[in-house]
Interface confidence: low
């Protein structure tokens, strides 16, 4: 039998054995910063580099002599995960290995950051294919070594980093939190959330995804035929470093930014159980485990978009939270949530020549959060137009007014502390669908953009008694790209977009009367690209094809029984 | 790595009169922030990583690192510029005493300064 | 000082099971893989697995994998082996042994005092 | 399955003699990258657990008198007690551990 992990992120359709090509990441460069590799072993033989890089501190304690070629052991085992012959991702994939951590798996930041540096020069020396830095470590959170990722991110590298094996949420460690890094959580073969000892897997919002982390066969560094099973986060970044070899060798033109939307896109969701996450860690930790895509074409035609949820903003009665897309993302909608459900709303505004994504707290409040909706969407021409409260009691509207522009996203804003319930919803007339709507006494913001091919539409789905969620799906073929609550009155949470769902939240059933007051109303807005899906039909049919696809039926790997040595 | 604090000091004593007449105020502007772990076991407080701001050369990196030494040279300290960061930040990684902190933080082209802290294998 | 302690002697029934406990102390239980190695009377060391107590991951040799159940209690420092569908070749004395660092193999640094585990009808 | 041979299976010596025991694999026990052998000797007494003695195909356990030694590399190895003392009647095991773990089949040191 297959290794379960190589099974898990294989997509339903295919055997794991024939999708998984003997040459597949061949056009891209891994470079692996860890503790020293056995680059003599069977299954990363000739794939791996060792550099003259080596910056480590010295080993704690009196009896580090007795641990040998433990140095070998972490570094070997993720290099194996990565491009192993056997039981590795991308089998073809080569790799580059310098050593920040010493033989008890510890490094300094410093030490870190001198590698990346000599990676960006080594980058600049000699350029090659697509890069991919795998950093399978932690620390705290530095400010430093995240500022080094922000630069080597931004320089077309794609760095893949475990989100610590602390049960915490990653936000407090890097490179974990650095946004320009994808980072990667650990669950297991029931597609749960990996537990290690005491502790475990992080979480929260600087996880872009879960990958395999638990049990995962690899080399081992005891002999040059050896393999062993290990468990950590650094195994499932090693999956997700192995993934991202694999669509860049298909793909080798994607940035950053589609990579990390092509991750998201072909992941399984919804298949961790977030009991396990702290109860105010679920809605911020994304449901989501990695897998290969089932083939490149196909995918260039979607509207990708993905969510992005802002740091809390903290009590304070001013305090605000912003959301920030990627450089090469679109913000197309904007919204927040709060707990504890004061909120003053939230507002799209442009920062530092970017839309960014403002909520707002309210007085009492215990800290809301802003969350952005981010987009590929090229050649995209997107602007906020806002509508300031309205006199009369109707409520607020404000339309795209523009040739061309399509409604994306709504948000709405209000300075008064307390919308009040007290008034009837205001549901959207009907044949206006490029309008937003909101409470009279607050300030909408709607997202218009304009762009090849670009269509929306509105879908509402409205509960007339209350309840604690109303959710919207956009259809098969359609983006979600805006998500937010009628009427926004202050029973309503907040409203934010799970994959292709929006999700509007209310304050708990029993505290709400079941009069007309409960009634909400989750309005998506739901997008397609007719002018992606075209470029990419003329693509398909302008070439051979040389994605994954056509190299699925290539020679079957066999799993021989005696890899199970360890297991 | 073998410790050169021996061939560092005469490095150290020669800068000393060549950096004396360098004004010690920083440049206008915002004031340079420290940065430390959060987790206190896993600081490695005497070394730091001095950031300088975006667009500063090699150059100037280098001589702000030897001015930072002219300086704790004068009060006393030693210091070891252990790396020189150019390509992706700049700035230098340096060996001193956090008495010098201050006087650091105070160096012109100076974005932010954090201790150096462990990482760990996951 | 370091020590592992081990459960008495057992007389079994060809068919039956057995559960070896072997507790440690005077060393962090989860810092050291536990293994298990018998010797059958007059005869030479045979090793049949261990387990890694910190993450409770086992790895058994090939002639016990059917047969054997290496698991721990960390909260007690205690692991245990059990060996089912007992044989009377199975007659032997097992021992428990601590193997420095968690995936070296390298070493028994210490062991237990042993286990005498009879099969007999 | 590695192979470990041990010879002699038995053999009878006097206080004060030099006696070695040898060790055969049926594969190199060389890890290439850290230099070191996966070997190991164990002394073990009647009625008590075995005890480690060196490790590393050289390296004493600490605590080992030092007329105990080990030699060899890659599928040959050799302890040696350079001067017989009472103590040290006992049957001797050598072990690999470079895949997973072999002992050998046990060489008995008796007095003559």
């Known amino acids: 039998s297959i290794p379960w992990n190589l099974e898990r992120i294989t997509p339903p359709r295919y055997r794991a054995d024939e999708y998984q090509p003997p040459d597949g990441g061949s056009l891209v460069e891994v470079y692996l910063l860890d503790t020293s590799i056995q680059s003599d072993h069977r299954e990363i033989e000739g794939r791996v580099m060792v550099t003259d890089f080596e910056n480590v501190p010295e080993e704690d304690g009196t009896r580090f002599h007795r641990q040998a070629s433990k140095c070998d052991s972490h570094g070997t085992h993720l290099a194996g995960v990565v491009s192993g012959r056997d039981a590795g991702v991308a089998k073809g994939a080569s790799m580059r290995s310098l050593r920040v951590l010493n033989c008890q798996g510890k490094g300094t930041v410093s030490g870190t950051l001198i590698g990346l540096e000599f990676i960006r020069k080594s980058q600049l020396v000699q350029p090659v294919g697509p890069l991919v830095v795998l950093l399978p470590l932690a620390g705290g959170y530095s400010r430093v070594l995240n500022a080094a990722c922000q630069r080597l991110a931004r320089a077309g590298v794609v760095l893949v980093t475990a989100a610590g094996n602390f049960r915490d949420d990653a936000c407090l460690y890097s490179p974990a939190s650095a946004p320009e890094v994808i980072t990667v959580g650990a669950t297991n073969a029931q597609d749960q959330p990996v537990t290690l000892g005491t502790l475990g897997t992080n979480f929260g919002r600087c996880v872009d995804l879960f990958a395999p982390g638990e049990d995962i066969i690899g080399a081992s560094s005891d002999c040059s035929t050896c393999f062993v099973s290990q468990s950590g986060t650094s195994q499932a970044a090693a999956h997700v470093a192995g993934i991202a070899a694999m669509m860049l060798s298909a793909e080798p033109e994607l940035t950053l930014a589609e990579l990390r939307q092509r991750l998201i896109h072909f992941s399984a969701k919804d298949v961790i159980n977030e009991a396990w996450f702290p109860e105010d860690q679920r809605v911020l930790t994304p449901n989501l485990v990695a897998a290969l895509p089932p083939s490149t074409h196909g995918a260039g035609w979607q509207l990708f978009c993905r969510t992005v949820w802002s740091a809390h903003s903290g009590p304070t009665r001013m305090a605000t939270a912003v959301a920030r897309c990627a450089p090469d993302e679109e913000l197309l909608s904007c919204s927040s949530f709060s707990r504890s459900g004061k909120r003053r709303g939230e507002r799209m505004e442009a920062q530092g020549g970017k839309l960014v994504c403002r909520a707002h707290n309210a007085f009492g409040g215990e800290g809301v959060y802003a969350i952005a909706r981010c987009c590929l969407l090229p050649q995209a021409n997107c602007s906020v137009h806002t509508a300031p409260p309205a006199e009369a009691s109707m409520g607020t509207r404000v339309h795209c007014h523009q040739q061309g522009h399509v409604l994306t996203g709504c948000s709405s804003h209000w300075e008064v502390e307390d919308l009040g319930t007290h008034k009837p919803p205001v549901l959207r007339p009907r044949g206006q669908p490029n309008q937003c709507v909101g409470h009279r006494e607050a300030s909408i913001h709607a997202s218009c953009c304009h762009a090849p091919g670009l269509e929306c539409k509105v879908k509402e789905h409205g509960i007339p008694a209350p309840q604690e969620q109303v959710t919207v799906a956009c259809e098969e073929g359609w983006t979600l790209t805006g998500c937010s609550a009628l009427p926004g009155t202050s029973h309503v949470l907040g409203a934010y977009a799970v994959d292709n769902t929006c999700v509007v939240r209310s304050r708990d059933v029993s505290t709400t009367g079941s009069t007309s007051e409960g009634a909400v109303t989750a309005v998506a807005i739901c997008c397609r690209s007719r002018h992606l899906a075209q470029a990419s039909q003329e693509l398909q049919g302008s070439t051979s094809g040389s994605g994954l696809n056509d190299i699925f039926e290539a020679q079957k790997i066999e799993w021989h029984e005696h890899h199970h040595h360890h297991h | 790595q073998e410790d050169e604090d021996g061939d560092y000091e005469e490095l150290v004593l020669a800068l000393r009169s060549e950096e004396d007449g360098l004004a010690e105020a920083p440049e206008h502007g915002t004031t340079a922030t420290f940065h430390r772990c959060a987790k206190d076991p896993w600081r490695l407080p005497g070394t730091y990583v001095v950031v300088l701001k975006e667009e500063t050369h090699l150059s100037q990196s280098e001589r702000t690192a030897r001015r930072l030494q002219a300086q704790a040279a004068r009060r006393g300290y030693l210091t070891k510029i252990l790396h020189v960061f150019h390509g992706l930040l700049p700035g230098f990684l340096v060996k001193m005493s956090g008495d010098l902190l201050e006087l650091a933080l105070k160096l012109p082209h100076v974005d932010y300064i954090e201790e150096d802290s462990s990482v760990f294998a996951q | 000082q370091v020590q592992l302690v081990q459960s008495g002697a057992e007389v079994k029934k060809p068919g039956a099971s057995v559960k070896v406990s072997c507790k440690a102390s005077?060393?962090?239980?989860?810092?050291?893989?536990m293994h298990w190695v018998r010797q059958a009377p007059g005869q030479g060391l045979e090793w049949m697995g261990y387990?890694?107590?910190?993450?409770?991951?086992?790895k058994y040799h090939q002639n016990f994998k059917d047969r054997v159940t290496m698991t721990r209690d960390t909260s007690i420092s205690t692991a245990y082996m059990e060996l089912s569908r007992l044989r009377s070749d199975d007659t032997a004395v097992y021992y428990c042994?601590?193997?420095?660092?968690?995936?070296?193999?390298?070493?028994?640094?210490?062991w237990g005092q042993g286990t005498t585990v009879t099969v007999s009808s | 399955d590695i192979q470990m041979t041990q010879s002699p299976s038995s053999l009878s010596a006097s206080v004060g003699d030099r006696v070695t025991i040898t060790c055969k694999s049926s594969?190199?026990?060389?890890?290439?990258?850290?230099?070191?052998?996966?070997l190991a000797w164990y002394q073990q007494k009647p009625g008590k657990a075995p005890k480690l003695l060196i490790y590393?195909?050289?390296t004493r356990e600490s605590g080992v008198p030092d007329r105990f030694s080990g030699s060899g590399s890659g599928t040959d190895f050799t302890l040696t007690i350079s001067s017989l003392q009472p103590e040290d009647f006992a049957t001797y095991y050598c072990?690999?551990?470079?895949?997973?773990?072999?002992f050998g089949q046990g060489t008995k040191l008796e007095i003559k």
């Open positions: 590393w195909a050289s």
């Open positions: 594969q190199s026990l060389l890890n290439s990258r850290t230099r070191k052998n996966f």
């Open positions: 387990i890694n107590p910190s993450s409770g991951f086992t």
């Open positions: 072990k690999q551990s470079f895949n997973l773990f072999t």
């Open positions: 005077g060393y962090t239980f989860t810092d050291y893989w």
């Open positions: 042994a601590r193997q420095y660092d968690y995936d070296e193999d390298w070493y028994f640094d210490v």
